[in-house]
């Protein structure tokens, strides 16, 4: 089956959600781990990640179509210490498949705002830190 990983971000008030989404077939969930790394160009692994999610096969989902699983990493207030390069990754212990998402970056600016760049589609986001709004 076709398995892929995408990265996205959303903002709720001051909170920034970094989201890793893996698309996979239902039967491929078992043994899959999704993880998010920061500033690790070569050695991104579940062991060195900021957060990881081990997928389980959900018997409640009917059919064999493609399903998605999400890892969400929430930062309550973005600070200069969060600036850096992030990457969503996944791997399967069963099949040996390794997925690496595109690198994306958080940049905290001198004005106290921050931007998230490198996300696919229309996912270049600029956030006003103080206002908590999408600008």
């Amino acid at each position: 089956g076709c398995i892929n990983i995408t990265s996205s971000a959303s903002q709720e008030g001051t909170r920034l959600n970094l989201i890793c989404t893996v698309w996979h077939k239902k039967e491929e969930a078992e043994g899959f781990v999704v993880f998010l790394c920061k500033d690790r160009s070569g050695d991104c692994s579940p062991e060195t990640s900021l957060k990881q999610l081990r997928l389980k096969r959900d018997p409640g989902i009917d059919g064999v179509g493609e399903i998605s699983s999400q890892l969400m990493f929430t930062i309550s207030q973005v600070t200069p210490l969060h600036s850096g390069t992030y990457q969503c990754c996944a791997r399967s212990q069963k099949s040996g498949i390794r997925l690496q998402g595109h690198f994306f970056s958080i940049l905290f600016t001198e004005t106290g705002n921050y931007t998230v760049t490198g996300l696919k589609q229309r996912q270049h986001l600029e956030f006003s830190h103080n206002e908590g709004t999408l600008s």
Partner: antibody
Framework: EVQLVESGGGLVQPGRSLKLSCAAS????????MAWVRQAPTKGLEWVAS????????YYRDSVKGRFTISRDNAKNTQYLHIDGLRSEDTATYYC????????????WGQGASVTVSS | EIILTQSPTTMTASPGEKVTITCRAS?????MHWYQQKPGASPKPWIY???KLASGVPDRFSGSGSGTSYSLTINNMEAEDAATYYC??????????FGAGTKLELK
């Protein structure tokens, strides 16, 4: 179990320099920003400096800029605070602390290193 | 720089009493964190993001507030709660600031 152990404190004469160390264990040190927070005798807590996870970006409270240098060695799981030109007002217990990644709280603290500046 | 003013500076409470410690910010802040410190010990995170209890904190503690006014409440004071409590916030560019502390003693 997370452990932060400070060392390098002691009695120092005004104008001298001092280097504090903080040895970390029990977590992936290279993933976390680190900080120093100090507490003068019988006084409250005061944030001093922070360093990002990679060590390339450092931040200081205004009153210590230019005299204090925070750094880290991820290979040794250790962070440092170098203080130049020590003053009597630098007398304090210096705590090593970890920055929680998802929040702005300091979630783990060392036992503290006592620094006394006196002639 | 945002200044955090805690009140009262010191207080005494009897076992079973309800205790409220307040922290006022000179400008609006998004979250407040609270730490407990006992003599000779390091501070411990006690309440984070205004209302979330840190691991191991008894549920007689609670936190609330928004904007410039935040509080820590103990519903039934116990002997082990005697300590100094500090509030803390983050904002840019002054970064991390603490209140001066509230010393809570057992009557």
């Amino acid at each position: 179990e997370v452990q932060l152990v400070e060392s390098g404190g002691g009695l120092v004469q005004p104008g001298r320099s001092l280097k504090l160390s903080c040895a970390a264990s029990g977590f992936i040190f290279g993933n976390y920003a680190m900080a120093w927070v100090r507490q003068a005798p019988t006084k409250g807590l005061e944030w001093v400096a922070s360093v990002n996870s990679g060590g390339g970006n450092t931040y200081y409270r205004d009153s210590v800029k230019g005299r204090f240098t925070i750094s880290r060695d991820n290979a040794k799981n250790t962070q440092y605070l170098h203080i130049d030109g020590l003053r009597s007002e630098d007398t304090a217990t210096y705590y090593c602390a970890t920055h929680n990644y998802e929040s702005t709280v300091f979630d783990y603290w060392g036992q503290g290193a006592s620094v006394t500046v006196s002639s | 720089e945002i200044i955090l003013t805690q009140s009262p500076t010191t207080m005494t409470a009897s076992p079973g009493e309800k205790v409220t410690i307040t922290c006022r910010a000179s400008s609006s802040v998004s979250y407040m964190h609270w730490y407990q410190q006992k003599p000779g010990a390091s501070p411990k995170p006690w309440i984070y993001e205004t209302s979330k209890l840190a691991s191991g904190v008894p549920d007689r503690f609670s936190g609330s507030g928004s904007g410039t006014s935040y509080s820590l409440t103990i519903n039934n004071m116990e002997a082990e709660d005697a300590a100094t409590y500090y509030c803390q916030q983050w904002n840019y560019p002054s970064m991390y600031t603490f209140g001066a502390g509230t010393k809570l003693e057992l009557k």
